[in-house]
Amino acid sequence: IMANLKVKDATQITQGPRSTIEKKGSRVTFTCQASFDPSLQPSITWRGDGRDLQELGDSDKYFIEDGRLVIHSLDYSDQGNYSCVASTELDVVESRAQLLVVGSPGPVPRLVLSDLHLLTQSQVRVSWSPAEDHNAPIEKYDIEFEDKEMAPEKWYSLGKVPGNQTSTTLKLSPYVHYTFRVTAINKYGPGEPSPVSETVVTPEAAPEKNPVDVKGEGNETTNMVITWKPLRWMDWNAPQVQYRVQWRPQGTRGPWQEQIVSDPFLVVSNTSTFVPYEIKVQAVNSQGKGPEPQVTIGYSGEDYPQ
């Protein structure tokens, strides 16, 4: 018996795909170079987590050409093992790489309010289920609130807690209609917020702040216009806030004149020309008054020299 033995070069992958970490939404390119016996029919194909990607090569998602696999619009479901398969009719070799897709965290799946009896002390406990970290550790959780009565669709941060925490007790302001949500944050940014909580209302209280930027200046020779920066609604501590405005000529020890107004200004008429006045503006609501206000010096209107 005569046998004819032909020895062929083994198929070798000379440069296989490299494991990589990519951001969600980006694209990744795997490359594969192989050497084949020139007398054999070469083939390079790609597999992803065990399934053949060849027939998907013309889709929007995958592009395969000249030993390259391009995956577009990466999502977390794309992560896994990708193999370059170099083959001939005689042999098959495979080189594998791991793709990790990273990005901002997933949504916080669940949010629960507890210790509702603490609302009388303007506190509540918020607990949540951890969010998916998407391969980058959660650094912190941001707790936000919305008041649908006063500022619908506007979310304000109440503070952030470390990423290993899944509950916190919040100090709340009086008379706010709180709806909460929690958002996980990692180095890639914030994720989608949690579903919103039930709405809770804290009890009313006297104001804890007074207006700032109090000024007094005349716009006529015999008046003084007192203005201030009104309290933000979250500092009203009640459904409404008003302002107790007091004034008296500087240096007199007599009683203060005052008016209660709701607009953030008051025109004091019948003043002497360019006289300094002591001014105080205090926040007032249905539960009481703000702290004792500081005194500001304002001036009534000026006149031309005689």
Epitope: Q242, R244, Q257, E258, Q259, I260, V284, S286, Q287
Partner: antibody, heavy 119, light 107 residues
Framework: QVQLQESGPGLVKPSQTLSLTCTVT?????????WNWIRQFPGKGLEWMGY???????SYNPSLKSRVTISRDTSKNQFSLKLSSVTAADTAVYYC????????????WGQGTLVTVSS | DIQMTQSPSSLSASVGDRVTITCKAS??????VAWYQQKPGKAPKLLIY???YRYTGVPSRFSGSGSGTDFTFTISSLQPEDFATYYC?????????FGGGTKVEIK
């Protein structure tokens, strides 16, 4: 329980000064709130005249111009109203009242005293 | 000064009726309106403040609503002791001013 009681002459001559006092029991007028004078004309209309606050500051109705003065005697827990240059149009039932909170309406009232301006 | 115009000036109703009184402010007063009840020979009694908040001890049949310039006071089911005169008052800014009153009489 907070109680307010007006006192003063029921008859005042035109051009003279009307003087009334409100005695407060059950609460110190220096602790908080505004302490008001309100009058009700024979036609039943109500008019706020002014107040003195717990701290001694005051606020008057500009419609009474400079005719009105409200003062207090903290040692007696009283506050007083003076209305000068009265005319028959000042004939009314005069009430003293304490505010609810610092504003927001009047929560406690005296029973009222009728003052007639007539010669 | 802010004028408060109340209507009607008087109305006749029976026990159990729903009674509505309106008050219109000459300018926007937000929700800074109070309502009072006055019986003959007595001082007014505070019922409602800040347009819709019942004062302590006031029965739930009394309610208020409105904001801006238009306000409503309602007695849901008139009781014998509710026949009286009712006044609105703005507490938006001094000088505080009252409406002219609505006398609720027995039909």
């Amino acid at each position: 329980q907070v109680q307010l009681q007006e006192s003063g002459p029921g008859l005042v001559k035109p051009s003279q000064t009307l003087s009334l006092t409100c005695t407060v029991t059950g609460y110190s007028i220096t602790s908080d709130y505004t302490w008001n004078w309100i009058r009700q004309f024979p036609g039943k209309g109500l008019e706020w005249m002014g107040y003195i606050s717990y701290s001694g500051s005051y606020s008057y109705n500009p419609s009474l111009k400079s005719r009105v003065t409200i003062s207090r005697d903290t040692s007696k827990n009283q506050f007083s109203l003076k209305l000068s240059s009265v005319t028959a149009a000042d004939t009314a039932v005069y009430y003293c009242a304490r505010s609810f909170s610092y504003s927001y309406g009047f929560a406690y009232w005296g029973q009222g005293t009728l003052v007639t301006v007539s010669s | 000064d802010i004028q408060m115009t109340q209507s009607p000036s008087s109305l006749s109703a029976s026990v159990g009726d729903r009674v509505t009184i309106t008050c219109k402010a000459s300018q926007d007063v937000s929700s800074a309106v109070a309502w009072y009840q006055q019986k003959p020979g007595k001082a007014p009694k505070l019922l409602i403040y800040s347009a819709s908040y019942r004062y302590t001890g006031v029965p739930s049949r009394f309610s208020g609503s409105g904001s801006g310039t238009d306000f409503t006071f309602t007695i849901s089911s008139l009781q014998p002791e509710d026949f009286a005169t009712y006044y609105c008052q703005q507490h938006y800014s001094t000088p505080w001013t009252f409406g002219g009153g609505t006398k609720v009489e027995i039909k």
